[in-house]
């Protein structure tokens, strides 16, 4: 007769491992007992379990509650056992020793491989600001056994670098994604992709990029200066900018306080019916946590009785 087993049994952490050991004997041969032991190099054999044709299953105290025979129906020549809830420490070499009658003893070894699927974590880098050089956008770390693969999936242009740390029974892989921040990257997804034989499908963690910036400010509303005449209603100035985080707006008048009746509504400055006292230099101040910008305009309210048109100056300042 001969023993049938596997060279390697692979299970995922927490799953049950079937350790196969089947005696393919000649007719009339019987299996008296099957002794299972862990036989890692440099250590003596450590009892796992003993399957006896008469006494039944004996489980070593170290494996109490974790070793079972496969469910019925059972073949008396089958010495396989189930190791419940495999842990990383179970990884190693196992031996089944089969005592048969009348053929004698046979033994076979197998290796149990316990896959430890990674639990990846993504850590964003420091705050991204437009104008910075090459900056860490995010790092992704995954530890498992064997070492997982960590890659990036994104439309954003950048560079990656990886490093690996080996532990006694696992390996941790960290991959970093560096980029030169620009406002076009804002809101773009950066996805860490972790592959591992213990995973049914790749694990993905997505980080949305936030790049701080503040665009130049400009003021709209003075495009047709002839509209700014005494008595006109609904005149308004609108401050234009954009940024991340979204900016706040503040209006001031350079040559004095804002005239009474002038309404500030965020980025918009609303005027009551125009009078000559509304003439002046108005400043829009745009700011966010990243930066601040100013834009100033000169309003000259025309008196229709005067024939000559007035020049309107638009000055933008940062």
């Amino acid at each position: 007769g001969e023993l049938e087993t596997s060279d390697v049994v692979t299970v995922v952490l927490g799953q049950d491992a079937k350790l196969p050991c089947f005696y393919r004997g000649d007719s009339g041969e019987q299996v008296g007992q099957v002794a299972w032991a862990r036989v890692d190099a440099g250590e003596g054999a450590q009892e796992l379990a003993l399957l006896h044709s008469k006494y039944g299953l004996h489980v070593s105290p170290a494996y109490e509650g974790r070793v079972e025979q496969p469910p019925p129906p059972r073949n008396p020549l089958d010495g396989s056992v189930l190791l419940r809830n495999a842990v990383q420490a179970d990884e190693g070499e196992y031996e089944c020793r089969v005592s048969t009658f009348p053929a004698g003893s046979f033994q076979a070894r197998l290796r149990l491989r316990v896959l430890v699927p990674p639990l990846p974590s993504l850590n964003p880098g420091p705050a991204l600001e437009e104008g910075q050089g090459l900056t860490l956008a995010a790092s992704c770390t995954a530890e498992g056994s064997p070492a997982p693969s960590v890659t990036w999936d994104t439309e954003v242009k950048g560079t990656t670098s990886s490093r690996s740390f080996k532990h006694s029974r696992s390996a941790a892989v960290t991959s970093e994604f560096h980029l030169v921040p620009s406002r076009s990257m804002n809101g773009q997804p950066l996805t860490c992709v972790v592959s591992h034989p213990g995973l049914l499908q790749d694990q993905r963690i997505t980080h949305i990029l936030h790049v701080s910036f503040l665009a130049e400010a400009s003021v709209r509303g003075l495009e047709d200066q002839n509209l700014w005449h005494i008595g006109r209603e609904g005149a308004m100035l609108k401050c234009l900018s954009e940024g991340q985080p979204p900016p706040s707006y503040n209006w001031t008048r350079l040559d004095g306080p804002l005239p009474s009746g002038v309404r500030v509504d965020g980025d918009t400055l609303g005027f009551p019916p125009l009078t000559t006292e509304h003439s002046g230099i108005y400043v829009c101040h745009v700011s966010n946590e990243f930066s601040s910008r100013d834009s100033q305009v000169t309003v000259d309210v025309l008196d229709p009785q005067e024939d000559s048109g007035k020049q309107v100056d638009l000055v933008s300042a940062s």
Partner: antibody, heavy 123, light 107 residues
């Protein structure tokens, strides 16, 4: 025919020592694990000590640990129990018995027993 | 240690009676259970091993059953020579432990 014959029992004072022997015959002595089991007068059976066929491993009941020593001489087919610091509660008939080692620390039932030797600890 | 609880501690029966003795282990011991018979002044004698296997030379009126934690010794038809004390013993772990015994007396 398998035979186990104990000897060495007797009367001893508390704190004294005694050495029991068990002579085996009729089977291959060094293929079997051996043990000592005792029975106090009018009481049940209590396992005392055991030894593997090659003497590599010995086992003791908590009640005798540190006081009793089991040993064997496979060349003489003999099992021993050295009993020191004897107490009144050690008074019992001492039996030797054989069992087959299946694997690791797993044994069959004891299929043959000696007739026993009486140990009396009294002042 | 594994505790073995035997019941009853004694029983009275007549020749020809069917006698049942039970033994319970404090934890699972598969079939690592033996039954012994002991007569006054004599050594214990193995009757049943592996919970249900009859030792060679033991009359077939003796039988054993059970596995795990609950076991039974049955004497199908009590004979005069069967009046004795019966012990169960587990040898699943060290130390092996015995039940307290069941004394079978003549009614």
């Amino acid at each position: 025919e398998v035979q186990l014959v104990e000897s060495g029992g007797g009367l001893v004072q508390p704190g004294g020592s005694l050495r029991l022997s068990c002579a085996a015959s009729g089977y291959n002595f060094d293929n079997y694990a051996m043990s000592w089991v005792r029975q106090a007068p009018g009481k049940g059976l209590e396992w005392v000590s055991g030894i593997k066929p090659d003497s590599a491993t010995t086992y003791y009941a908590d009640s005798v640990k540190g006081r009793f020593t089991i040993s064997r001489d496979n060349s003489k087919n003999t099992l021993y129990l050295q009993m020191n610091s004897l107490r009144a509660e050690d008074t019992a008939v001492y039996y030797c018995a054989r069992a087959e080692l299946l694997a690791f620390d797993v044994y069959t039932a004891s299929d043959y027993w000696g007739q026993g030797t009486l140990v009396t600890v009294s002042s | 240690d594994i505790q073995m609880t035997q019941s009853p501690s004694s029983l009275s029966a007549s020749v020809g009676d069917r006698v049942t003795i039970t033994c319970r282990a404090s934890q699972g011991i598969s079939s690592y259970l033996a039954w012994y018979q002991q007569k006054p002044g004599k050594a214990p004698k193995l009757l049943i091993y592996a919970a249900s296997s009859l030792q060679s030379g033991v009359p077939s009126r003796f039988s054993g059953s059970g596995s795990g934690t609950d076991f039974t010794l049955t004497i199908s038809s009590l004979q005069p020579e069967d009046f004795a004390t019966y012990y169960c013993q587990q040898h699943y772990t060290t130390p092996p432990t015995f039940g307290q015994g069941t004394k079978v007396e003549i009614k």
